[in-house]
């Protein structure tokens, strides 16, 4: 597995990992950190493992956390109701 | 070939439950999402939620959020939607349909032949 | 939810003509620069068939005359040159937002 740079699926990602889009070359897809508390994210981010290529540049929040919304279009991962 | 097969219409009571079936052939099971969506009789499209077939995980419409389940059986490529309290509006079509992976961008690139179901009493 | 209107709600047009569908979301389905709507072709008695996804990108198999634009809360499906075999409804459905919605739907018919 690959644990930090380039990727095109989540399987080549070390744990606790997805395969995202670069923030800095939208073209290339990287090994990115899942969100931890208080990350941005998407909440329609595919959950990990994802056998597709992701488009967003943020990986799902981690496991016990959820993509909710705070105010108009901005999300954050929270601690899951 | 990617095929999506459905079970047949149903005709339930008020009241009732029922669960549809559809089996998924031609391409790796588990490494697709499905969704599922219904279509009232001449109306529009109506999304429902969908299920990752690799682990289980659902996202539902809020709308039929407690009346819904989405489920798979990984062993026969199977996927299953259950609707409770069934009420004459959920007269429809129900149709199963396979996201085609293109990222975030879900899209339903396979569809069921859909599976009718008639809520009357 | 987000809310999506097409416009018109049916079209006739001429064998060989362009058509043109609208459809206009309640809010943007636009997220860092990508936007997130499809659009589907729906025969009778038929399920529906995804012909572009992501806005502008063409499903595989699907001809070249048909095309798609738009951003933010303002889309089009064109049919360059309308087909017999184009008769149909057609919907929008946005899928930056769970639930994800669709258009009313539009039918083209041939004038």
């Known amino acids: 597995a690959v644990i930090t740079g380039a990727c095109d699926k989540d399987s080549q990602c070390g744990g606790g990992m997805c395969c995202a889009v670069s923030i800095w070359v939208k073209s290339i897809r990287i090994c990115t950190p899942m969100g931890k508390l208080g990350d941005s994210c998407h909440p329609l981010t595919r959950k990990v493992p994802f056998f597709g290529r992701r488009m967003h540049h943020t990986c799902p929040c981690l496991p016990g956390l959820a993509c909710l919304r705070t105010s108009f279009n901005r999300f954050i991962c929270l601690a899951q109701k | 070939e990617v095929q999506l097969v459905q079970s047949g219409a149903e005709v339930k009571k008020p009241g009732a439950s029922v669960k549809v079936s559809c089996k998924a052939s031609?391409?790796?099971?588990?490494?697709?999402?499905m969704h599922w969506v219904r279509q009232a009789p001449g109306q529009g499209l109506e999304w429902i939620g969908y299920i990752s077939c690799y682990n289980g995980a659902t996202t539902y419409n809020q709308k039929f959020k407690g009346r819904v389940t989405i489920t798979v059986d990984k062993s026969t490529s199977t996927a299953y939607l259950e609707l409770s309290s069934l009420r004459s509006e959920d007269t429809a079509v129900y149709y199963c349909?396979?996201?085609?992976?293109?990222?975030?961008?879900?899209?339903?690139?396979?569809w069921g032949q859909g599976t009718l179901v008639t809520v009357s009493s | 939810d987000i809310v999506m209107t097409q416009s018109p709600d049916s079209l006739a047009v001429s064998l060989g003509e362009r058509a043109t569908i609208n459809c206009k979301a309640s809010q943007s389905v636009d997220y860092e620069g990508d936007s997130y709507m499809n659009w589907y072709q729906q025969k009778p008695g038929q399920p529906p068939k995804l012909l572009i996804y992501a806005a502008s990108n063409l499903e595989s198999g699907v001809p070249d005359r048909f095309s798609g634009s738009g951003s933010g809360t303002d889309f089009t499906l064109t049919i360059s040159s309308l087909q017999a075999e184009d008769v149909a409804v057609y919907y929008c459905q946005q899928i930056n937002e769970d639930p994800f919605t669709f258009g009313q739907g539009t039918k083209v018919e041939i004038k």
């Open positions: 349909a396979r996201d085609g992976n293109y990222g975030e961008a879900y899209a339903m690139d396979y």
């Open positions: 031609g391409y790796s099971f588990t490494d697709y999402d």
